[in-house]
Interface confidence: low
C-alpha cells in the first residue's frame, strides 16, 4: 500500500508535514478501539487521502480519522501540537495502545496544566515526580484513580513508580491504611504489598476482591493469613455464609485447604450451586478487538498467580478454562490420588480427563489409572482399551467406583483388558470380580470360561452361578469336580451342588448312591438329557425327603420330560400321584434321532403297533 505524500497538516507550525500521522495502522495492532467506537458499530478508520488534501486543525478530525498513528510521526511535532493531539484524542474518546500513550507522554515534556483535558490513561505514563507539590499531586492522583491501571503490567516501570508517589502524596506512613486512603489509591490499591494486607485487612481485603489481575505471591499469603485469622470484615471461615462467599469472589482462588475445610460444607455447596447458575459468573467477553487467533490464545493463558502448585480444594473455584490453562497435566498425573477427595463437578472432571488424554495419548500408565477414582466414570471403552492394567489393586480401586451399579461397558472393557493381560482368570481375580459382580462368571462365554483354572473355582459362590446357562455350566462343572475331588461325600456335595447344571447322567447316578438329599431347586437346574435316563429309584435316592416336591413340578422341565420316560407303575411306587408315565403294555422305542429333535421319547401306542403288542401279550401270558 502506498503512503500518502507528505504535506503541511498543522497550519503555521512549520514542522515537517505528517503525511501518515493519522494513517490507519489497525491491522498492525496499533490501536484497540473502544467498544462504542469500533466494537458494536462496526466503524472502521476512514481513508486519509481526502483529509490530507485539505488539512483542517486536529480537533476537527473525526474519531475514525484519529484511529491510528505511529510514534515516529509524533516525534516530529512540537509539544504544543502533541498537547493538541492528546486533547483531541480525549475529546473523541479514542482508545490508544500502550505504545501510543507512552509515546505521547514522552513528548509532553513539561507537566501539563489542564490534566482534565488529557486522555485519562495517558496520565499513567506521566512521571509523578513532575507533580510534587501537595496540590499538584492531589490533582494528579485524583485523576489517576479513575484511570485503568491495568493497561500497565505489574512489572512496568511506569506502574511501579506510581504507588510510592501516591502513598507519599496522600500522607500514608507505615502500613496502616484508612478506608479513605484505600479509596484515594483507586486501582493502585491492588499493588499494595503483603504488609499492608496484613495490617489493614479490614479495609483492604474488600478492595482486593475486585482487583482485575491476580494477586502476587506476597499478597496472596497475607490475604490467606488474614482470612484464616478470622478477623473483620469477614470473620472466622467457620461462620461464613453464602453472602460471605459472594463478597469474597475475587479472593476465592487464594483460599488454601485449611480455610476451605473450615467453611461449613453446606455453605460451599449452596454457594457453588447458586454460582453455577448465576450468569454473572460467566467469563466476561473480551471487549478489545483483536485478531481472532489472539483471543483464543489469551483464553488459554493462565492468569498470573493462578498456576496450580498442587491439586487441592481451591481448584473447585476455577472455571473450566482456568483449570485447562492453570493445571499442569504432569502435576495432575502425579497427584491423581487427591482428585477423588475434591468435589469437582462433572464438567470440571471433563477438563481434567482432557488434560490426561493430552499427556498420555497412547493410554494412561497404571500409576495414574489406579488413582482415577470417579474420573474412571468419564472414560470410554475406547480409552480403556489403550490401558495395560496388571495390578489387582488397580482393578479393585476402579471396580469400587462403579460399586452398586450394573456392569457398564467401561467395566466390562476393563475386566476384559485385565483378564487378557493375565492370561487366565486366577482365583484372586475371580474372587475380586465376583465380589463386585456376582453375575460376572455367567457373563463370560464358554470359550472364555475355559481359561478358568480349576483352582479358581474355590472362589465361586452359589449366587455367582445363578444366571449361568447350561453351556456355561458344562464348562465349569468338570473344573469344579476336579477342584473338589479330594473332599468327602457330604462336603463335596455342598461345594459341587451349584455346578450340577453341567453334570452328566453317570455323575448324577453316582450322587444318588451318596444319600445327598438334593433340593428341588437344584434338581430343576439339571440338564434334561442327564436326568432322563435316571430311574425312579435313582431319583428317589437323589432327592431323599425332597422327592415330594416332584408333584409340584410335574408340568415343568426336566421333571415333565422325565415322567414321560418312566413306567407309570414305577411312578406310582412314589405315592405322589404323578401322572403321564408309560402305561403298562406300552413299548418304549428309543429312537434317538427323533428324541433329539422332539425332546420326548417315541411311544408306540395301540393301532400302528398291534403286532408288537400281540407279541408282548403272548410273551407275558407264556
Amino acid at each position: 500500500m502506498a503512503l500518502p505524500t507528505a504535506r503541511p497538516l498543522l497550519g503555521s507550525c512549520g514542522t515537517p508535514a505528517l503525511g501518515s500521522l493519522l494513517f490507519l495502522l489497525f491491522s498492525l495492532g496499533w490501536v484497540q478501539p473502544s467498544r462504542t467506537l469500533a466494537g458494536e458499530t462496526g466503524q472502521e478508520a476512514a481513508p486519509l487521502d481526502g483529509v490530507l488534501a485539505n488539512p483542517p486543525n486536529i480537533s476537527s478530525l473525526s474519531p475514525r480519522q484519529l484511529l491510528g498513528f505511529p510514534c515516529a510521526e509524533v516525534s516530529g511535532l512540537s509539544t504544543e501540537r502533541v498537547r493538541e493531539l492528546a486533547v483531541a484524542l480525549a475529546q473523541k474518546n479514542v482508545k490508544l495502545s500502550t505504545e501510543q500513550l507512552r509515546c505521547l507522554a514522552h513528548r509532553l515534556s513539561e507537566p501539563p496544566e489542564d490534566l482534565d483535558a488529557l486522555p485519562l490513561d495517558l496520565l499513567l505514563f506521566l512521571n509523578p515526580d513532575a507533580f510534587s507539590g501537595p496540590q499538584a499531586c492531589t490533582r494528579f492522583f485524583s485523576r489517576i484513580t479513575k484511570a485503568n491501571v491495568d493497561l500497565l503490567p505489574r512489572g512496568a516501570p511506569e506502574r511501579q513508580r506510581l504507588l510510592p508517589a501516591a502513598l507519599a502524596c496522600w500522607g500514608v506512613r507505615g502500613s496502616l491504611l484508612s478506608e479513605a486512603d484505600v479509596r484515594a489509591l483507586g486501582g493502585l490499591a491492588c499493588d499494595l504489598p503483603g504488609r499492608f494486607v496484613a495490617e489493614s485487612a479490614e479495609v483492604l481485603l474488600p478492595r482486593l476482591v475486585s482487583c482485575p489481575g491476580p494477586l502476587d505471591q506476597d499478597q496472596q499469603e497475607a490475604a490467606r493469613a488474614a482470612l484464616q485469622g478470622g478477623g473483620p470484615p469477614y470473620g472466622p471461615p467457620s461462620t461464613w455464609s453464602v453472602s460471605t462467599m459472594d463478597a469474597l469472589r475475587g479472593l476465592l482462588p487464594v483460599l488454601g485447604q485449611p480455610i476451605i475445610r473450615s467453611i461449613p460444607q453446606g455453605i460451599v455447596a449452596a454457594w457453588r450451586q447458586r454460582s453455577s447458575r448465576d450468569p454473572s459468573w460467566r467469563q466476561p467477553e473480551r471487549t478489545i478487538l483483536r485478531p481472532r487467533f489472539r483471543r483464543e490464545v489469551e483464553k488459554t493463558a493462565c492468569p498470573s498467580g493462578k498456576k496450580a502448585r498442587e491439586i487441592d480444594e481451591s481448584l473447585i473455584f476455577y472455571k473450566k478454562w482456568e483449570l485447562e490453562a492453570c493445571v499442569d497435566a504432569a502435576l495432575l498425573a502425579t497427584q491423581m490420588d487427591r482428585v477423588n477427595a475434591i468435589p469437582f463437578t462433572y464438567e470440571q472432571l471433563d477438563v481434567l480427563k482432557h488434560k490426561l488424554d493430552e499427556l498420555y495419548p497412547q493410554g494412561y500408565p497404571e500409576s495414574v489409572i489406579q488413582h482415577l477414582g470417579y474420573l474412571f466414570l468419564k472414560m470410554s471403552p475406547e480409552d480403556i482399551r489403550k490401558w495395560n492394567v496388571t495390578s489387582l489393586e488397580t482393578l479393585k480401586a476402579l471396580l469400587e467406583v462403579n460399586k452398586g451399579h450394573e456392569m457398564s461397558p467401561q467395566v466390562a472393557t476393563l475386566i476384559d483388558r485385565f483378564v487378557k493381560g493375565r492370561g487366565q482368570l486366577d482365583k484372586d481375580t475371580l474372587d475380586t470380580l465376583t465380589a463386585f459382580y456376582p453375575g460376572y462368571l455367567c457373563s463370560l462365554s464358554p470359550e472364555e470360561l475355559s481359561s478358568v483354572p480349576p483352582s479358581s473355582i474355590w472362589a465361586v459362590r452359589p449366587q455367582d452361578l445363578d444366571t449361568c446357562d447350561p453351556r456355561q455350566l458344562d464348562v465349569l462343572y468338570p473344573k469344579a469336580r476336579l477342584a473338589f475331588q479330594n473332599m468327602n461325600g457330604s462336603e463335596y456335595f455342598v461345594k459341587i451342588q451349584s455346578f450340577l447344571g453341567g453334570a452328566p447322567t453317570e455323575d448324577l447316578k453316582a450322587l444318588s448312591q451318596q444319600n445327598v438329599s438334593m433340593d428341588l431347586a437344584t434338581f430343576m437346574k439339571l440338564r434334561t438329557d442327564a436326568v432322563l435316563p435316571l430311574t425312579v429309584a435313582e431319583v428317589q435316592k437323589l432327592l431323599g425327603p425332597h422327592v415330594e416336591g416332584l408333584k409340584a413340578e410335574e408340568r415343568h422341565r426336566p421333571v415333565r420330560d422325565w415322567i414321560l420316560r418312566q413306567r407309570q407303575d414305577d411312578l406310582d411306587t412314589l405315592g405322589l400321584g404323578l401322572q403321564g408315565g408309560i402305561p403298562n403294555g406300552y413299548l418304549v422305542l428309543d429312537l434317538s434321532m427323533q428324541e433329539a429333535l422332539s425332546g420326548t421319547p417315541c411311544l408306540l401306542g395301540p393301532g400302528p403297533v398291534l403286532t408288537v403288542l400281540a407279541l408282548l401279550l403272548a410273551s407275558t401270558l407264556a
Epitope: 460444607q265 453446606g266 455447596a269 457453588r272 450451586q273 453455577s276 468435589p343 470417579y374 466414570l377 452398586g404
Partner: nanobody, 130 residues
Framework: QVRLVESGGGSVQAGGSLRLSCAAS???????????LGWFRQAPGKEREAVAR????????YYADSVKGRFTISQDNAKNTVYLQMNSLKPEDTAMYYC????????????????????WGQGTQVTVSS
C-alpha cells in the same frame, strides 16, 4: 427460598418402626437433573452421620452399614417428599434426624457420602427406648 420440613419423629420401643417424611418447598426434587437426597442423624456428643441417601436420577440408594436392611429411603416426586422408613429400631438409633438436599452433584458424590448438602431441615427427634 428452599425449606425442608421433617416430620414423623417420636418415641418408640426397641424393635418398633417409624416413618420420617421430609417435605420441600421452594424447590422441586424432580426439577433438577442431578441431586442427592439424604437423611442424616446426630446423637448428643457425636458427629453427624449420613444414614441414607438416594440419587433419583438412577434410583440408586446408599445406606450406612449400621442401618442396612432395617431402613429404607424413598421419594415421592408428586408430593415433593422424601421418606425414611425405619424398622427394627434399636436404642442406638436415638438421635436428631435431619433431611438434606445436595443440588447439582453427581451420583458419585451421593454414593460416597461426600456430597455437599446445601439445604438442611430443622430436624426431627427419634428416641428408641429399651
Amino acid at each position: 427460598q428452599v425449606r425442608l420440613v421433617e416430620s414423623g419423629g417420636g418415641s418408640v420401643q426397641a424393635g418398633g418402626s417409624l416413618r420420617l417424611s421430609c417435605a420441600a418447598s421452594g424447590y422441586t426434587y424432580s426439577s433438577y437433573s442431578s441431586n442427592c437426597l439424604g437423611w442424616f442423624r446426630q446423637a448428643p456428643g457425636k458427629e453427624r452421620e449420613a444414614v441414607a441417601r438416594i440419587y433419583p436420577n438412577s434410583g440408586s440408594t446408599y445406606y450406612a452399614d449400621s442401618v442396612k436392611g432395617r431402613f429404607t429411603i424413598s421419594q415421592d416426586n408428586a408430593k415433593n417428599t422424601v421418606y425414611l422408613q425405619m424398622n427394627s429400631l434399636k436404642p442406638e438409633d436415638t438421635a436428631m434426624y435431619y433431611c438434606a438436599v445436595a443440588v447439582g452433584v453427581g451420583d458419585n458424590w451421593c454414593a460416597s457420602g461426600a456430597a455437599y448438602f446445601g439445604y438442611w431441615g430443622q430436624g426431627t427427634q427419634v428416641t428408641v427406648s429399651s
